[in-house]
C-alpha cells in the first residue's frame, strides 16, 4: 500500500530553477527543481527525473515522498536530515532509483517514517545499520511499520563476497530497531534460505511476503512467535515439502493465511503428513490448486486428492544389492 496522493493542485518548480544552487536556506514550502508538489495532499513527486541525489530543499510539509525512477546510486547517512527535520514524512518510495548502496543512518531524523519502499534497486551494499542508524546492540526503535524490499538483489557479478540473505537479515535485525515492523516484503530476491533467527526478532509482523524466491526448505525457520501474522506469501519458491514442525507452528497461529502456489512439491512418502494436514487445515489459501511436480509419475496430481498409497518412496537398497 504505497502512499497515494488523491488531492490535485500539484505545482512544478520552474524550469529555470533546475540548475540553480542557492546559498540561502530554502523557503520552507518551495518545491524542489524537477519535482511536483501538492501542499494539500502533503505530497512531493520527483519521478523519472534522473536525479543523482535527494533534493536538499524538500518542503517541511511533505508527508508522502516519491523519488522513484531516478539514478541515486548511493544513499548516504542522513540523506533526509534537514533543519528543521522532515517531521511529517510518513511514506518514502525510492523504488527503481538505481541505488546500489544504502549507508548506515540513511533514514535518520525521520521521526514519522512509517512506510519505506526500496524495491527494484540492485542493493549490493546495504549497511547493517541502514534502518537502525546505530551500531548499538539495542538501538532506538525505528518508526517503520512497513518495509518493502522486493527485487533488491543485485546481478550476481555485482554481489559482495558474502551471502545476500545474510546482508539483508543483518539490516533487519540490527539493534532490534524494527520490532514494530508489521509488513515486510522480500519478494523476488533469489533467497535460497531464510536465516533461522530473523522472524523471532520481528514479533509484530502481520504480513510477510517471501514469494518468488528460491527457498527450498523451511525446516529451520520458526514461526512460533509470530502471533499476529496474518498473511505469509511463499508462492513461486522451490519448496518440496513442509515438515511436521512447520505445519504445527503454522496451524498454531490464530490469524494466519498461507499462500503456497507454484512450488515444485515432491509427492513421495515424505509428503504424507503435509497432505493429511492440507485436507484438514483452513490455513492454506487456494490449497486445491497445489499440485505435484515430482516424481514424474505424479506430475500435476492435486495434493488434496492424494492418499497414503500414492505417496511412496523407492526403497533404498542395501549396498550389496546396489548396482553401479
Amino acid at each position: 500500500s504505497s502512499p497515494t496522493s488523491s488531492a490535485s493542485s500539484f505545482s512544478s518548480s520552474a524550469p529555470f530553477l533546475a540548475s540553480a544552487v542557492s546559498a540561502q536556506p530554502p523557503l520552507p514550502d518551495q518545491c524542489p527543481a524537477l519535482c511536483e508538489c501538492s501542499e494539500a495532499a502533503r505530497t512531493v513527486k520527483c519521478v523519472n527525473r534522473n536525479l543523482t541525489e535527494v533534493p536538499t530543499d524538500l518542503p517541511a510539509y511533505v508527508r508522502n515522498l516519491f523519488l522513484t525512477g531516478n539514478q541515486l546510486a548511493v544513499l548516504p547517512a542522513g540523506a533526509f536530515a534537514r533543519r528543521p527535520p522532515l517531521a511529517e514524512l510518513a511514506a518514502l518510495n525510492l523504488s527503481g532509483s538505481r541505488l546500489d548502496e544504502v549507508r548506515a543512518g540513511a533514514f535518520e531524523h525521520l521521526p514519522s517514517l512509517r512506510q519505506l519502499d526500496l524495491s527494484h534497486n540492485p542493493l549490493a551494499d546495504l549497511s547493517p545499520f541502514a534502518f537502525s542508524g546505530s551500531n548499538a546492540s539495542v538501538s532506538a526503535p525505528s518508526p517503520l511499520v512497513e518495509l518493502i524490499l522486493n527485487h533488491i538483489v543485485p546481478p550476481e557479478d555485482e554481489r559482495q563476497n558474502r551471502s545476500f540473505e545474510g546482508m539483508v537479515v543483518a539490516a533487519l535485525l540490527a539493534g532490534r530497531a524494527l520490532q514494530g515492523l508489521r509488513r515486510l516484503e522480500l519478494a523476488s530476491n533469489h533467497f535460497l534460505y531464510l536465516p533461522r533467527d530473523v522472524l523471532a526478532q520481528l514479533p509484530s509482523l502481520r504480513h510477510l511476503d517471501l514469494s518468488n524466491n528460491s527457498l527450498v526448505s523451511l525446516t529451520y525457520v520458526s514461526f512460533r512467535n509470530l502471533t499476529h501474522l496474518e498473511s505469509l506469501h511463499l508462492e513461486d519458491n522451490a519448496l518440496k515439502v513442509l515438515h511436521n514442525g512447520t505445519l504445527a507452528e503454522l496451524q498454531g497461529l490464530p490469524h494466519i493465511r498461507v499462500f503456497l502456489d507454484n512450488n515444485p512439491w515432491v509427492c513421495d512418502c515424505h509428503m504424507a503428513d503435509m497432505v493429511t494436514w492440507l485436507k484438514e487445515t483452513e490455513v492454506v489459501q487456494g490449497k486445491d490448486r497445489l499440485t505435484c511436480a515430482y516424481p514424474e509419475k505424479m506430475r500435476n496430481r492435486v495434493l488434496l486428492e492424494l492418499n497414503s498409497a500414492d505417496l511412496d518412496c523407492d526403497p533404498i537398497l542395501p549396498p550389496s544389492l546396489q548396482t553401479s
Epitope: S1, V145, G180, R206, S231, P254
Partner: antibody, heavy 118, light 113 residues
Framework: EVKVEESGGGLVQPGGSLRLSCAAS????????MSWVRQACGKGLEWVSI???????YYASWAKGRFTISKDNSEGMVYLQMNSLRAEDTAVYYC????????????WGQGTTVTVSS | EIVLTQSPSSLSASVGDRVTITCQSS????????LSWYQQKPGKAPKLLIY???TLASGVPSRFSGSGSGTDFTLTISSLQPEDFATYYC?????????????FGQGTKLEIK
C-alpha cells in the same frame, strides 16, 4: 467503490433476537478484520465485537454469550446475531473495517437502528 | 475492564482557537501506539482522523495532530475552523493472551462559543 453497508435493524421485543448484516464491497473480506460498534441515542461509541480475516472472534465482555459475529467471505457479508435483547441494546449499530496494518477503524457504514421495546 | 477517559467532556471555543483534548487509558495500548481519534457529526458515522497515535488519516487537514504513547494521548486542533465543531472520540486497541479488545473514550463535544 470500497464501502460497507448495514441492514437488518428494526423493532424487537425484550428477550427477542435479531441478526444484523453488513455487506462489504470493493475489497476482500478474507483480507480484513471487521467489527461492530454501537451508539445509543445521545451517547458515545461502544465497541461490540470483531472478526479476524481468517475468522477468529473477539467480544466486549458484556457481549459475550449474547452476541455472535460471523462472516461469509465468498458472499462478502458480516453478521451480528443478537440474542436475549434488552432495552439497553437499543442503538445505532455500525459495521466498520479495520486497517490491514494498523488496528484502527478506517471505513464505516452509515449504521442500522435497533430498537428493543415492548 | 479497560477504560479510556477523555477530558474535557465538552468545551466551547471560537474559530481560530487552538484546542487540545486528552485521552487517558487505564492500560497501555498495543505497541504503545495503537490509539486512534475520530470525528463524528450529528446523524453521521464517525470519521477517522488520526491513527497510530500521531499519523494523519488520508485527506485530514494538517491542523489536526496527535501525540502521546502508552497510556496518555492528546489530540490538538491548531486553528479551529467552522467545520471542526463536532464530537471527538479516542479509541484504543489492546492485546493480551486472551486476545484483542477495543475501547472508546466517552467523547468530547466541541461547541462554538
Amino acid at each position: 467503490e470500497v464501502k460497507v453497508e448495514e441492514s437488518g435493524g428494526g423493532l424487537v421485543q425484550p428477550g427477542g433476537s435479531l441478526r444484523l448484516s453488513c455487506a462489504a464491497s470493493g475489497f476482500s473480506l478474507s483480507s480484513y478484520w471487521m467489527s461492530w460498534v454501537r451508539q445509543a441515542c445521545g451517547k458515545g461509541l461502544e465497541w461490540v465485537s470483531i472478526i479476524a480475516g481468517r475468522g477468529s472472534t473477539y467480544y466486549a465482555s458484556w457481549a459475550k454469550g449474547r452476541f455472535t459475529i460471523s462472516k461469509d467471505n465468498s458472499e462478502g457479508m458480516v453478521y451480528l446475531q443478537m440474542n436475549s435483547l434488552r432495552a439497553e441494546d437499543t442503538a445505532v449499530y455500525y459495521c466498520a473495517r479495520v486497517s490491514s496494518i494498523y488496528y484502527t477503524f478506517n471505513l464505516w457504514g452509515q449504521g442500522t437502528t435497533v430498537t428493543v421495546s415492548s | 475492564e479497560i477504560v479510556l477517559t477523555q477530558s474535557p467532556s465538552s468545551l466551547s471555543a471560537s474559530v481560530g482557537d487552538r484546542v487540545t483534548i486528552t485521552c487517558q487509558s487505564s492500560q497501555s495500548v498495543y505497541s504503545n501506539n495503537e490509539l486512534s481519534w475520530y470525528q463524528q457529526k450529528p446523524g453521521k458515522a464517525p470519521k477517522l482522523l488520526i491513527y497510530y497515535a500521531s499519523t494523519l488519516a488520508s485527506g485530514v487537514p494538517s491542523r489536526f495532530s496527535g501525540s502521546g504513547s502508552g497510556t496518555d494521548f492528546t489530540l490538538t486542533i491548531s486553528s479551529l475552523q467552522p467545520e471542526d465543531f463536532a464530537t471527538y472520540y479516542c479509541q484504543g486497541s489492546y492485546y493480551s493472551g486472551s486476545g484483542w479488545y477495543y475501547a472508546f473514550g466517552q467523547g468530547t463535544k466541541l461547541e462554538i462559543k
